[in-house]
């Protein structure tokens, strides 16, 4: 089995208030089975940004069709960026578990920061 890796290619993403930001994340394996979630921050206080299996995230859309059985692209777009959105975003793979899924591997994170306003 190829060991799963979480790839977040950008360490830093400069964004503009009011625009849409794209956060990239790809995986190198579909196994073990389990969902991919996006968080801002780390530790117990981290904020859930997107959960592929449930929830309502009105500002978040996926770049790829996650219903494809061979999908390895879990990149997301966040619309209408505000200063409150800055922080470091992590895509995290969970493996199935009972009663709760278990965190399996995290990407290295992408820091979202505000860039200069266009003149």
């Amino acid at each position: 089995e190829e060991e799963l890796q979480m790839i977040q290619p950008e360490k830093l993403l400069l964004v503009t208030v009011g625009k849409t930001a794209t956060l990239h994340c790809t995986v190198t394996s579909l196994l073990p089975v389990g969902p991919v979630l996006w968080f801002r921050g780390v530790g117990p206080g981290r904020e859930l940004i997107y959960n592929q299996k449930e929830g309502h995230f009105p500002r978040v859309t996926t770049v790829s069709d996650l219903t494809k059985r061979n999908n390895m692209d879990f990149s997301i777009r966040i619309s209408s960026i505000t200063p409150a959105d800055v922080g470091t975003y992590y895509c995290v793979k969970f493996r199935k578990g009972s009663p709760e899924n278990v965190e399996f591997k995290s990407g290295p994170g992408t820091e979202m920061a505000l860039g200069a306003k266009p003149s």
């Epitope: 579909l30 196994l31 089975v33 592929q52 449930e54 069709d65 219903t67 059985r69 061979n70 009972s98």
Partner: antibody
Framework: DVQLVESGGGVVRPGESLRLSCAAS????????MSWVRQAPGKGLEWLAG????????YYIDSVKGRFTISRDNSKNSLYLQMNSLTAEDTAVYYC???????????WGLGTLVTVSS | ALTQPASVSANPGETVKITCSGG??????YGWYQQKSPGSAPVTVI????KRPSDIPSRFSGSASGSAATLTITGVRVEDEAVYFC???????????FGAGTTLTVL
């Protein structure tokens, strides 16, 4: 309420074709992968084919690959199964089913009966 | 292939367990589907190993470990008489499979 209603079943002769339809309502059809499952008389359930939400990716069991084609029209909230070169072994009730995020099934249609007989 | 017992029986109020083996925990999710008569629409009672749809009574529960899944009905009722199919999705092959079905008789 989620509703899936199949149609298009009937009696056909071996070698003929049939196109099944599944009309979906009560949910955002374009956000869900869908599948077709059949049940032959006195037998168990058999998954046949699945299709991604956008319709670009399709998956089949080996025994129907090249003979059956799954497709969808998200503008019509409809799922289809084109069945060619039918044989008596294709006689069954055909169900459409909505997939969960991990490709199991949460809602099923009532089914449509296909009989292949000479 | 998924293997499940052909039949199980129980008295009302008893606990029933139906097992399904043949999948790989690393790559497989399981579901359980109830069919009350042949040719009638199946009803999903468990998906994602242990997730119960909101309209399914709490006496139905599911679990998975190793290469097997288990459907448990705690306090079985006469109306639970049906054939129960286990199903699996394999993330290696992208294929869904079903067991042959278990007929539950409530005495």
């Amino acid at each position: 309420d989620v509703q899936l209603v199949e149609s298009g079943g009937g009696v056909v002769r071996p070698g003929e074709s049939l196109r099944l339809s599944c009309a979906a309502s009560g949910f955002t059809f374009s956000s869900y992968a869908m599948s077709w499952v059949r049940q032959a008389p006195g037998k168990g359930l058999e998954w046949l084919a699945g299709i991604s939400a956008g319709g670009s990716d399709t998956y089949y069991i080996d025994s129907v690959k090249g003979r059956f084609t799954i497709s969808r029209d998200n503008s019509k909230n409809s799922l289809y199964l084109q069945m060619n070169s039918l044989t008596a072994e294709d006689t069954a009730v055909y169900y459409c089913a909505r997939e969960t995020w991990n490709h199991l099934f949460d809602y099923w249609g009532l089914g449509t009966l296909v009989t292949v007989s000479s | 292939a998924l293997t499940q017992p052909a039949s199980v029986s129980a008295n009302p109020g008893e606990t029933v367990k139906i097992t399904c083996s043949g999948g790989d925990y690393y790559s497989t999710y399981y579901g359980w589907y109830q069919q009350k008569s042949p040719g009638s629409a199946p009803v999903t009672v468990i998906h994602s190993d242990d997730k119960r749809p909101s309209d399914i009574p709490s006496r139905f529960s599911g679990s998975a470990s190793g290469s097997a899944a288990t459907l448990t009905i705690t306090g079985v009722r006469v109306e639970d008489e049906a054939v129960y199919f286990c199903g699996a999705y394999d993330g290696r092959t992208y294929i869904n499979t079903f067991g042959a079905g278990t007929t539950l008789t409530v005495l």
